[in-house]
């Protein structure tokens, strides 16, 4: 089971470092997106995970953004950012055999309304329940 | 453009609790964190804690049990309180806008804790 | 907590040569890190976050390196107004902290 924890840390850390990258492979990030929605966490560790991937980063000042999937919708009445950038996007995470461009990387700033957890606990969580 | 600004009493007694407001325009609160940091006279800065575009907040460990951020959006406004004050808490307080790293600082409140 | 150790504590330099100040964390904190100038009197600014990225308005003789626990804050040509004392921050995890600070002078 440890073994098959770090395998799956491994596999996260680098569809994380990696996203964005290829917009003819974006099975894993799509796949991470929804555990991400589902779970109602971002990232492995903490949201800060995603702070080095370069195509979600602001600029300068603005530069700490997460993608959409960690938006806690829950969290929010700000309809405007929920109709149009938010729900098009999480509409997407049930067809996660799409293909994407890159142009179509939903990002959100990390400092508004998203899931402050890291995913590893709750993934693990499960892993010892299955 | 983006203002900070912090307003606090000056001089407290020990043992009493400490209440700065920090203003703020030319952003959202909803979607910037807020972060609170002090520096003791002649000292290096200390992170406080940091209240997010949710509400949600993060404490310095030691200071969790004294420390409470909150925050009025109709007002713009962040509030800092922080009880059971000694000698130690002598320093200039200031807020910035930022959770993670603080791009727009007040230009601080000296307190200073004296009876 | 994560420990976050500055050094030198202090140099003096003079102008247009090139100045280095490093910072190490206890554990790794991912490039979740800041830099910041402060002179005497006045608040402290921004220069640098995620490791390398530049705030906006900084001059580009400004640059941040570094990854895991080691990290740096380049001055390629000092210029006079860059005296003050420099902090790095981290911001991994849930609780951020700074360094103890460098003091720039100039020679």
């Known amino acids: 089971r440890a073994q098959l924890e770090r395998s799956l840390r491994d596999v996260v850390e680098k569809t994380i470092q990696k996203y964005g990258t290829n917009p003819e492979e974006t099975a894993a990030e799509e796949s991470w997106d929804y555990v991400q929605f589902q779970l109602r966490c971002c990232g492995w560790h903490y949201p800060q995970d995603w702070f080095q991937v370069l195509i979600l980063r602001g600029n300068g000042s603005e530069a700490h953004r997460v993608p959409c999937s960690c938006y806690n919708l829950s969290a929010t009445n700000d309809s405007t950012i929920l109709d149009k950038v938010i729900l098009p996007q999480l509409s997407r995470l049930g067809h996660l055999a799409r293909s994407r461009h890159s142009a179509d990387i939903c990002a959100v700033p990390a400092e508004s309304h998203i899931y402050r957890e890291g995913c590893a606990q709750g993934l693990q969580k499960w892993l010892h329940n299955n | 453009q983006v203002q900070v600004q912090e307003s606090g009493p000056g001089l407290v007694a020990p043992s009493q609790t400490l209440s700065i407001t920090c203003t703020v325009s030319?952003?959202?609160?909803?979607?910037?964190?807020v972060s609170w940091v002090r520096q003791p006279p002649g000292k290096g800065l200390e992170w406080l804690g940091v209240?997010?575009?949710?509400?949600?907040?993060n404490y310095h460990p030691s200071l969790k049990s004294r420390l409470s951020i909150k925050k009025d959006h109709s007002k713009s406004q962040v509030f800092l309180k922080l009880n059971s004050l000694t000698a130690a808490d002598t320093a200039t307080y200031y807020c910035a806008k930022g959770g993670y790293s603080l791009a727009h600082w007040g230009q601080g409140t000296l307190v200073t804790v004296s009876s | 907590d994560i420990q976050m150790t500055q050094s030198p504590s202090s140099l003096s330099v003079s102008v247009g040569e090139r100045v280095t100040i490093t910072c190490r964390a206890s554990?790794?904190?991912?490039?979740?890190l800041a830099w910041y100038q402060q002179k005497p009197g006045k608040s402290p600014k921004l220069l640098v976050n995620?490791?390398?990225n530049l705030a906006d308005g900084v001059p580009s003789r400004f640059s941040g390196s570094g990854s895991g626990t080691d990290y740096s804050l380049k001055i390629n040509s000092l210029q006079p107004e860059d005296f003050g004392t420099y902090y790095c921050q981290h911001y991994w995890g849930t609780t951020w902290t700074f360094g103890q600070g460098t003091k720039l002078e100039i020679k």
């Open positions: 209240i997010w575009g949710d509400g949600s907040t």
């Open positions: 995620v490791a390398t």
């Open positions: 554990e790794n904190i991912r490039s979740n």
């Open positions: 030319g952003f959202s609160l909803t979607t910037s964190g």
